[in-house]
């Protein structure tokens, strides 16, 4: 029961995390104009991974896409790549984890198969979360560097006669969404990996002696395990976690149509 809960919770947390990563990637507020030096500006600038926007005090917002690929900074391209990789891995992880969920039955899929799928999706979520965190952190580092560079150059070039306030950018909402989403995906992935340990058959516990009788093969197991049919994967053992209560697929002791596939 605890394993199912851990797996289910891991899936939900990862789902929220990946939705957050997608949202952060699409958001325009990766960097927003720093108003500390010019709090009275009537024009507000903010930038995303795909376009930059200007909101005028009238409420009119104009956004322009980055229509160049080669002209963009390498760091921005790297951030884009990291976020996309994170989304792709996360999406695949979600797809795999749906089939791995203990509460969902697909044919006579064994717990060991579900355990492997849970581990796979867990690793994918961990990598996805790390990609998002890395992407957001790289962008944040880029902002910090540019912020201090623009601060140093803020009032240069006009001989002190005319103030030319250079626009500085600070952390936008997307960065925080990205960090949180990446963290959630990472946590979800770890939970999936923990759930996998509970799902996987532990060889050390399976001190089963197999007696082959004439007719059809039946493997007899010590207490806590039940005999499986001699059809299909007859050497796979299923552990009963709830003190003898049988799950739906464990009650089936005769071959079904799925066993022949």
């Amino acid at each position: 029961m605890a394993v199912t809960a851990c797996q289910g919770l891991g899936f939900v947390v990862s789902l929220i995390g990946i939705a957050g990563i997608i949202a952060a990637t699409c958001m325009d507020q990766w960097s927003t104009q720093d108003l500390y030096n010019n709090p009275v500006t009537a024009v507000f600038n903010y930038q995303g991974l795909w376009r930059s926007c200007v909101r005028e005090s009238s409420g009119f917002t104009e956004c322009r896409g980055y229509f160049t690929l080669l002209g963009l900074p390498a760091m921005l391209q790297a951030v884009r790549a990291l976020m996309i990789v994170g989304i792709v891995l996360g999406a695949i992880g979600l797809l795999v984890s749906i089939f791995a969920l203990k509460c969902i039955r697909i044919g006579s899929m064994e717990d060991s198969a579900k355990a492997n799928m849970t581990l796979t999706s867990g690793i994918m979520f961990i990598v996805s979360g790390l990609c998002a965190i890395a992407g957001v952190s790289v962008f944040a580092n880029m902002l910090v560097t540019n912020f201090w560079m623009s601060t140093a150059n803020m009032y240069t070039g006009m001989g002190g006669m005319v103030q030319t306030v250079q626009t500085r950018y600070t952390f936008g909402a997307a960065l925080f969404v990205g960090w949180v989403a990446g963290g959630l995906t990472l946590i979800g992935g770890v939970m999936m990996c923990i759930a996998c340990r509970g799902l996987a058959p532990e060889e050390t516990n399976y001190k089963a002696v197999s007696y082959h009788a004439s007719g059809h093969s039946v493997a007899y197991k010590p207490g806590g395990f039940k005999a499986s049919t001699g059809f299909g994967s007859n050497t796979k053992n299923k552990k009963i976690y709830d003190g003898g209560a049988r799950t739906e697929d464990e009650v089936q002791s005769y071959p079904s149509k799925h066993d022949y596939v």
């Epitope: 104009q33 010019n38 009275v40 500006t41 009537a42 024009v43 600038n45 903010y46 930038q47 930059s52 926007c53 200007v54 005028e56 005090s57 009238s58 409420g59 009119f60 104009e62 322009r64 005319v162 103030q163 030319t164 306030v165 250079q166 626009t167």
Partner: antibody, heavy 119, light 113 residues
Framework: QVQLVQSGAEVKKPGASVKVSCKAS????????MHWVRQAPGQGLEWIGM????????NYNEKFKSRVTMTVDTSTSTAYMELSSLRSEDTAVYYC????????????WGQGTTVTVSS | DIVMTQSPSSLSVSVGDRVTMTCKSS????????????LTWYQQKPGQPPKLLIY???TRESGVPDRFSGSGSGTDFTLTISSVQPEDFATYYC?????????FGGGTKLEIK
């Protein structure tokens, strides 16, 4: 078509308050900022502040912040500008102007309200 | 506050003349985010409210004759009337639209010679 009709001329004594109204028609009143600008006799233009009818949010010129109050009545599509503690230098023509959505410049102006402050 | 300085304060010209008036701001009105200059030009005739001519330093408002053109960037701006018509004799104001409070220049009065 867009129209901004302002209230009539006012004569006030120093220290008193004046409330100028601006009735809008021909457009969605709640979608545009309403600006207030004044012009003293023979002088240039001076921006007082602005109000957004939908949210009621305001932005005042620091010079007038302590004395000005801008309000709106969305049911009648009317904007109000109240200036308190009047002085003789507040004698001017007060204009309301609608905020143009595609740029931040006002594109429709009221006919102006003459406020005279005299003892 | 941004100080807007217009010159000359008055200008005497004949119909058909080409006219140029300047506006200087104490701070740059160029927004790096979209490379637009937030400067507006108004025309005002006696007893009338101002009329918007040009915004974003060079974009003509709809209905404004093409003899009016705006140029400049950063802190220096120019309004040019290619061929002055009788209805153009008025006072012209530039306005900072970049920073609160929005400030106006002192105006340039265009008079008949």
């Amino acid at each position: 078509q867009v129209q901004l009709v302002q209230s009539g001329a006012e004569v006030k004594k120093p220290g008193a308050s004046v409330k100028v109204s601006c009735k809008a028609s021909g457009y969605t009143f709640t979608s545009y900022w309403m600006h207030w600008v004044r012009q003293a006799p023979g002088q240039g233009l001076e921006w007082i502040g602005m109000i957004h009818p939908n949210s009621g949010s305001t932005n005042y010129n620091e010079k007038f912040k302590s004395r000005v109050t801008m309000t709106v009545d969305t049911s009648t599509s009317t904007a109000y500008m109240e200036l308190s503690s009047l002085r003789s230098e507040d004698t001017a023509v007060y204009y309301c102007a609608r905020r143009y959505y595609g740029s931040i410049s006002p594109d429709y102006w009221g006919q102006g309200t003459t406020v005279t402050v005299s003892s | 506050d941004i100080v807007m300085t217009q010159s000359p304060s008055s200008l005497s010209v004949s119909v058909g003349d080409r006219v140029t008036m300047t506006c200087k701001s104490s701070q740059s009105l160029l927004n790096s985010g979209n490379q637009k200059n937030y400067l507006t030009w108004y025309q005002q005739k006696p007893g009338q409210p101002p009329k918007l001519l040009i915004y974003w330093a060079s974009t003509r408002e709809s209905g404004v004759p093409d003899r009016f053109s705006g140029s400049g960037s950063g802190t220096d701006f120019t309004l040019t009337i290619s061929s002055v018509q009788p209805e153009d004799f008025a006072t012209y104001y530039c306005q900072n639209d970049y920073s609160y409070p929005f400030t106006f220049g002192g105006g340039t009065k265009l008079e008949i010679k």
